[in-house]
Interface confidence: medium
């Protein structure tokens, strides 16, 4: 029986050329999280894996970095990143959890590029 | 517009403590999201704390165990609790609404750890 949920950050928002921090925490399970995979609608991100650590696809390498925690910082947004992003925590026993996150990239007025930062 | 106005900041002595405040205050999706960052002189911005709107918490390893993070949802204010204070701990402390910061950022706050 699955028993956990997902909380997420919902909807949220950034400017073209900012940056943004993806973020999924399951809860209210006792199940292991044997890995976590990021998904733009069909593409994958990135992977956390329990035991093999953190794959980012080579086609986001440039723009995507693992973090904090099991999240995902998204860099450079483009109006393009709009769209559904999903954390799928695959666990044991009980299966797979999905939480979904709605990304919506602003036409920046102010400033061309965003602010970038390091995550330790 | 999102604005964030960071506040508590100031010139404090190392193994001291101080409670810096971010107040949010515009348009903004609800998502719940804060987030605490900090720029050392010198050096880049660095992402410091988060905390999740059900109170999930996530750290960077240099200040794990020293600062807590936490969040009013209903007064869209967030909190950074620094203790045992350090001075590479100095640094110009800035805050994230929902996950999305912008150039240009607030004008954060001051951070002093010096004798």
């Known amino acids: 029986m699955m028993t956990g949920t997902i909380e997420t950050t919902g909807n949220i928002s950034a400017e073209k050329g900012g940056s943004i921090i993806l973020q999924c925490h399951l809860s209210s399970t006792t199940a292991q999280v044997t890995q976590v995979n990021w998904e733009q609608q069909d593409q994958l991100l990135a992977i956390c894996n329990a035991d093999l650590g953190w794959h980012i696809s080579p086609s986001f390498k440039d723009r995507v970095a693992p973090g904090p925690g099991l999240g995902l910082t998204l860099q450079s947004l483009t109006v393009n990143d709009t769209g559904e992003y999903f954390c799928i925590y695959h666990t044991y026993p009980d299966g797979t959890y999905t939480g979904r996150i709605f990304l919506e990239v602003l036409e920046s007025s102010v400033a061309e590029h965003g602010a970038r930062f390091q995550i330790p | 517009e999102v604005q964030l106005v960071e506040s508590g900041g100031g010139l404090v002595q190392p193994g001291g403590s101080l409670r810096l405040s971010c107040a949010a205050s515009g348009n903004t999706f609800s998502g719940g999201f804060m987030g605490w960052f900090r720029q050392a002189p010198g050096k880049e911005r660095e992402w410091v704390a988060s905390?999740?709107?059900?109170?999930?918490?996530w750290y960077a390893d240099s200040v794990k165990g020293r600062f807590t993070i936490s969040a009013d949802n209903s007064k869209n204010t967030a909190y950074l609790q620094m203790n045992s204070l350090k001075p590479e701990d100095t640094a110009v402390y800035y805050c994230a609404k929902d996950g999305g910061w912008f150039d240009p950022w607030g004008q954060g706050t001051l951070v002093t750890v010096s004798s």
């Open positions: 905390v999740l709107r059900g109170g999930y918490t």
